[in-house]
Interface confidence: medium
């Protein structure tokens, strides 16, 4: 039901990385505008992105209030220039999104190698603890703060002169690995939540190699 000159939104999709969360939908509006509402299972609907001609709405501010809640959104369609107009059932057309639980589903952003330091035949590789938009006590939490021990990092490392990769894992943000003295190594890391069923892994970080600026070397 609904007025003939509005169409319901479709293909409602959550796009979320490190809790930055945007709802996207189709179609591009022709003579219509959209308003989005978001709710938890037990909560009231809250309106966002009022009468927009966009086909996306940033819902980060709502979902970061509690990333373990399950959220539902809906997109209302209104005739452009007449947003009070409703469908024949007395309501504007709307479409529901799939449910979304940020903690379980947000994509892990590409990590960054913060530094590496060689001491003799050991190299300490540190992963940047990326800040999220999740707040506690007025401070932004890091990815590690939010996920705790659910989050691990996998390090891939190899001699610059060969392609044979080795791996190491940590549930902190640091690796301590053994290397051959006098050899240069390259590193890449990946964030992983092993116990997830979806979106378990991030993309690999940019490769960093010894002998370039990021590292620090101390021969013992």
């Amino acid at each position: 039901s609904g007025t003939t000159n509005t169409v319901a939104a479709y293909n409602l999709t959550w796009k979320s990385t490190n809790f930055k969360t945007i709802l996207e939908w189709e179609p591009k509006p022709v003579n219509q505008v959209y308003t989005v509402q978001i709710s938890t299972k037990s909560g009231d609907w809250k309106s966002k992105c009022f009468y927009t001609t966009d086909t996306e709405c940033d819902l980060t501010d709502e979902i970061v209030k509690d990333v373990k809640q399950t959220y539902l959104a809906r997109v209302f369609s209104y005739p452009a220039g007449n947003v009070e107009s409703t469908g024949s059932a007395g309501e504007p057309l709307y479409e529901n999104s799939p449910e979304f639980t940020p903690y379980l589903e947000t994509n892990l952003g590409q990590p960054t190698i913060q530094s590496f330091e060689q001491v003799g035949t050991k190299v300490n590789v540190t992963v940047e603890d990326e800040r999220t938009l999740v707040r506690r006590n007025n401070t932004f939490l890091s990815l590690r703060d939010v996920f705790g021990k659910d989050l691990i990092y996998t390090l891939y490392y190899w001699k610059s002169s060969s392609s044979g990769k080795k791996t190491a894992k940590t549930n902190t943000n640091e690796f301590l690995i053994d290397v051959d003295k006098g050899e240069n190594y390259c590193f890449s890391v990946q964030a992983v939540i092993p116990s997830r069923t979806v979106n378990r892994k991030s993309t690999d970080s940019p490769v960093e190699c010894m002998g370039q600026e990021k590292g620090e070397f101390r021969e013992i």
Epitope: T40, K68, Q69, L104, I152, N171, P194, S195
Partner: antibody
Framework: EVQLVQSGAEVKKPGASVKVSCKAS????????MNWVRQAPGQGLEWMGE????????TYNQKFKARVTLTVDQSTNTAYMELSSLRSEDTAVYYC???????????WGQGTTVTVSS | SIQMTQSPSSLSASVGDRVTITCKAS??????IAWYQQKPGKSPKLLIY???NRYTGVPSRFSGSGYGTDFTFTISSLQPEDIATYYC?????????FGGGTKVEIK
């Protein structure tokens, strides 16, 4: 199908040690923390500790820290809980449980009854 | 460690009744609450996680709600097979701790 199969019942004397095993199947063993929970007769549930099968790193309930040791054998997908210096109040059913993402225990072993009696 | 106080410790209700169990945390645990069902001689079974999410395969008559320190578990229409002891557990901060349990019986 996820399964956690525990070793059989044990009867021990005070001061002895017991080692309970928990064999996991049906999932990636190194991808989930394994927890140990005990339940004394007619009592509630008490968390003992957890181990990361990927790294072997453990976290213990302070109450048991001096007496419990958690280990894993990745080659057999088996977790172990050893409790030493047993006393009568350690008589309980001991469960292994897989911790799901975010904290809850989604799968439990069938339980191992440990009786401590002189 | 965070203490979990569960009430009542036991209750008796008729088939079809709405049953409510409460759990209070000694400090805020956000949404970090799970609820378990344990039948005599059996292992506990996860019903609810993140305070309000039903675990896979759990019937819709079981529900949970709450945030912070006060949580509620509800069986909307008690069935004979629901006779069991129910436990809350906080999984917000280690050491993970359980409530004392609520034994549910049929009148």
């Amino acid at each position: 199908e996820v399964q956690l199969v525990q070793s059989g019942a044990e009867v021990k004397k005070p001061g002895a040690s017991v080692k309970v095993s928990c064999k996991a199947s049906g999932y990636s063993f190194t991808g989930y923390y394994m927890n140990w929970v005990r339940q004394a007769p007619g009592q509630g549930l008490e968390w003992m500790g957890e181990i990361n099968p990927s790294t072997g790193g453990s976290t213990y309930n302070q109450k048991f820290k001096a007496r419990v040791t958690l280990t894993v054998d990745q080659s057999t997908n088996t977790a172990y809980m050893e409790l030493s210096s047993l006393r009568s109040e350690d008589t309980a059913v001991y469960y292994c449980a897989r911790r799901e993402l975010g904290g809850p225990f989604g799968y439990w072993g069938q339980g191992t009854t440990v009786t401590v009696s002189s | 460690s965070i203490q979990m106080t569960q009430s009542p410790s036991s209750l008796s209700a008729s088939v079809g009744d709405r049953v409510t169990i409460t759990c209070k945390a000694s400090q805020s645990v956000s949404q970090g609450i799970a609820w378990y069902q344990q039948k005599p001689g059996k292992s506990p079974k996860l019903l609810i996680y993140f305070a309000s999410n039903r675990y896979t395969g759990v019937p819709s008559r079981f529900s949970g709600s709450g945030y912070g320190t006060d949580f509620t578990f509800t069986i909307s229409s008690l069935q004979p097979e629901d006779i069991a002891t129910y436990y809350c557990q906080q999984d917000y901060s280690s050491p993970w701790t359980f409530g004392g349990g609520t034994k549910v019986e049929i009148k």
